[in-house]
Structure formats: C-alpha cells, structure tokens
C-alpha cells in the first residue's frame, strides 16, 4: 500500500506512515503528502538542506536512506515493486536559490528490477522545469559509487557524487553534493536538472513524488 | 593485472556433473560480478550466467537453467560453475569473465578458458 | 530474447584498408553495446563498450558509433595483428546475447 491508499482510508494529513511492500508484509516508513494537487503522493526523494550524505551504496540505495521528515530516499526496491505493481506518475518538484519553483511531470513512470539495476523509465513529459526531459531517454540504469552502470568511462556516480539513472553524465542529478547558497554555481557535481537550470547550477531543494495514474 | 585462471575441465560422460573453478588475483574479487561463457568448438560465444559481487543475485539463459550453478567463496577469490545433467552440447571452452562492476552486464576481463568435453 | 545480427560473417581486406562491421539488434538496446576481438586460440578482449567507449589499452584506430538498434565497428586501418574474428554483444537485458562473429582476413 502507498500513500494514495492512505489518503483514500481517510488519512489526509501530510506526514511519516508505514507503508507495506506489495504482495508481502515488508514494511517501510515514508512521507506522504496529502495536500499538493490533491494528496496521495509518496515521496520517494527529499533534499533540502545537505544534512544527508547521498554518497552511498548500492544497498543503501536500495533499501532507502535518511530521515522521511528530511532528506532521504526512499528505497529503490520498494519503488520497482510499487511501480511494477499498476501505473504511476512522477512528479519532480524543484527550487532554485532565488525563490523560483518548478516542476516536471511523467504520466507514466516505473523502474525495473534490480536484475536491469532499477532502470528507469519514463513517458509523458509536462511541467514547467523544461520542455525536454534532464532524465536521458530512453532510461539507463542505476549507478552508484560502488556499482558503476553508466555510459562514460568516467564514472559518473565517483565523479558527480550520489546514485542516479547516469547515462554518460546526463543532463540530470537530483542526488549529487548539496552546496549552500553563493556557492551553488559552476559546480559540475551539485543538484543538477540541467532543462531548467542548466549545467553548472546546484539547486536549493528537491522532492520526487509518485502517485496511481488512476488517482 | 587482472589474472583469471580456470580450472576442472575435462572430458565427462553425458548425464554426469562436472565442477569447473576460477582463480581470480589481481584486483578486489568481492566488488564485481562475475560471468561465465562458452564457445563450441569452431562455433560463436554463448553467455551461460552471471552472479553479483555479493553472491545475492544470479541470473542464466535458458540453455543451461536449472542443470548449471554459479557461484563464488569471496574469502577464496574463487569463481563456480557447477554443471549437471551434461549432454554432449555442453562441449565447448567455458570461461571466465570478470564484470566491470558490481553488475553492469559489460563483460571486462576474460580468463584463457578450460576445455569441458561430453562424449561417452 | 534480443538477437544480435553481425554483418558480414567474413570479409577479405589487405593492410591499411579502412573496415566496417554492422551489428543489429532486434530491438532498441539504447547503447548498450560492445565488442570484442578473439584471436585463433586465444580468450575473447574487450573492444569497445556503450557503444563507443574504447577500453583501456585500445588503440583509437577503433572505433564505434550507432543508436536503436544499429551498431558499427569500424577499423580505421588494418593492420597484420588485427586479423581475427570480431563479435558484438547486447547487454541491454538477459540474457546476454552476442553476434555470430566477423572473421577478417587477409587478402
């Protein structure tokens, strides 16, 4: 269950529930947010003030990371099995340090197993954080400091810092270093959505939300 | 320098087991996955399976699932490729081939191969 | 599964000449590309991979290009130690699949 059921069950606070992993009794705690366009949105990435170290493990990756009231990641085996499970959606919401928001939208969003390293993939971009999507397409697979998967014979997670669907960079790492503001330019490694904010630009703050397409 | 050495082959009745072994020296065993490849005599490559670097996650073609399996000692630096029900199919040079990452699919380094012969 | 078709399966050059090998997929495999060398008796080496990144040790008389589902291998000028066979593989999903092979020869 995920936070559109926990909205429909009359839960419609925002805040920290025990979600269940599907098909199994597997628990994991996440945010939910039940207010932005009409709630039941489950936030499976937050950054917001550099107090969690996303350079970390393919494991960790994984199995989630952080603190869901702050900065974390929610897990990317409990996103594959959710996603895999019916359709979703995937908002990006992003500010920059000058007080403007974004977002982009993909009507269709899910990951792969971790046999194809969690790949991603994407449909139907909107939104108003650039016409073209700064997640390559078609979708690579995931990468990590320790599990190099990407397209460059840099390595891109080493090299740009935090796990992330590299391709050879790519045009995108909402998981890379968190830099504060006045340092937040030219920086190669920062929290990069290259479509909106271009290459050298560390963004403020971050949440990637998914919710049922059918919500 | 990355070394892969393969070991165990030989020549095997059909329908028995054989048990051929990698060596591997020369960089962090533990932090790749491994594969293993065969090619007929005279014919083209076949990739047969892969485990990760932690041993948690192996996946096979259907030509030799459920008769084959792979597996590692890190403590050893050893790789494993145990095969079962042999038929005279199976015959080829099996090697053994280091990942370029924990599980990246891209195959890295190759061992000189051992020789598996099925014939009664 | 995704099945690789190599072309030609054997091709007859002499030293200096420029060389091209295709490789198509059946299906998009997105980059995830590589190529192989193998020498008569000898284990297969890593070319290329993604397509078009050179490994270590490689000489940039290599090359590689391609998207979707068609893939080349290209050899700017042959040399005498670059007659063998060469193969590509998808590693875009299990299982990996490879190309028959291109054997090159001198002629």
């Known amino acids: 269950r995920d936070c559109a059921e926990v909205f429909k069950s009359g839960h419609t606070t925002n805040g920290i529930y025990t979600l269940t992993f599907p098909n199994s009794t597997e628990e994991i705690k996440a945010y939910c947010d039940m207010e932005a366009g009409g709630g039941g949105w489950t936030i499976i990435q937050r950054r917001e003030d550099g107090s969690v170290d996303f350079q970390r493990t393919w494991k960790e990756y994984k199995v989630g990371f952080g603190n869901p009231s702050g900065e974390y990641w929610l897990g990317n085996e409990f996103v594959s099995q959710l996603t895999n499970q019916q359709r979703y959606v995937l908002k990006i919401h992003l500010k920059d340090w000058e007080g403007n928001e974004a977002y982009s939208l993909y009507e269709h969003f899910y990951l792969s197993s971790e046999e194809l390293n969690y790949r991603i993939h994407l449909k139907g971009l909107t939104g108003t954080a650039g016409k073209i999507s700064s997640i390559s397409q078609p979708g690579n697979d995931f990468s990590t400091k320790d599990g190099d998967n990407d397209k460059c014979i840099c390595k891109c997670s080493q090299m740009l810092t935090g796990g992330w669907w590299f391709d050879a960079c790519g045009p995108s790492n909402l998981n890379g270093m968190y830099y504060p503001q006045r340092q937040n330019t030219n920086k190669f490694n920062g929290i990069k959505w290259y479509y909106w904010k271009g290459s050298g630009y560390s963004l403020k703050a971050t949440t990637m939300m998914i919710r049922p397409a059918d919500f | 320098q990355v070394k892969l050495v393969e070991s165990g082959g030989g020549v095997v009745q059909p329908g028995r087991s054989l048990r051929v072994s990698c060596a591997a020296s020369g960089f962090t065993f533990s932090s790749y996955g491994m594969h293993w490849v065969r090619q007929a005599p005279g014919k083209g490559l076949e990739w047969l399976a892969i485990i990760w670097y932690d041993g948690d996650n192996k996946y096979y073609s259907d030509s030799v699932k459920g008769r084959f399996t792979i597996s590692r000692d890190n403590s050893k630096n050893t790789l494993y490729l145990q095969m079962n029900s042999l038929r005279a199919e199976d015959t080829a040079e099996y090697y053994c081939?280091?990942?370029?990452?924990?599980?990246?699919?891209?195959?890295?380094?190759w061992g000189q191969g051992t020789l598996v012969t099925v014939s009664s | 599964d995704i099945q690789m078709t190599q072309s030609p399966s054997s091709l007859s050059a002499s030293i200096g000449d420029r060389v091209t090998i295709t490789c198509r997929a059946t299906?998009?495999?997105?980059?995830?590309l590589a190529w192989f060398q193998q020498k008569p008796g000898k284990a297969p080496k890593s070319l290329i991979y993604a397509t078009s990144n050179l490994q270590s040790g490689v000489p940039s008389k290599f090359s590689g290009s391609g998207s979707g589902t068609d893939y080349t291998l290209t050899i700017s000028s042959l040399q005498p130690e670059d007659f063998s066979t060469y193969y590509c593989?998808?590693?875009?999903?299990?299982?990996?699949?490879f190309g028959g092979g291109t054997k090159v020869e001198i002629k």
């Open positions: 299906q998009d495999i997105n980059n995830y």
């Open positions: 081939v280091r990942d370029a990452s924990i599980a990246s699919r891209f195959l890295d380094y």
């Open positions: 593989q998808q590693y875009h999903s299990y299982p990996l699949t």
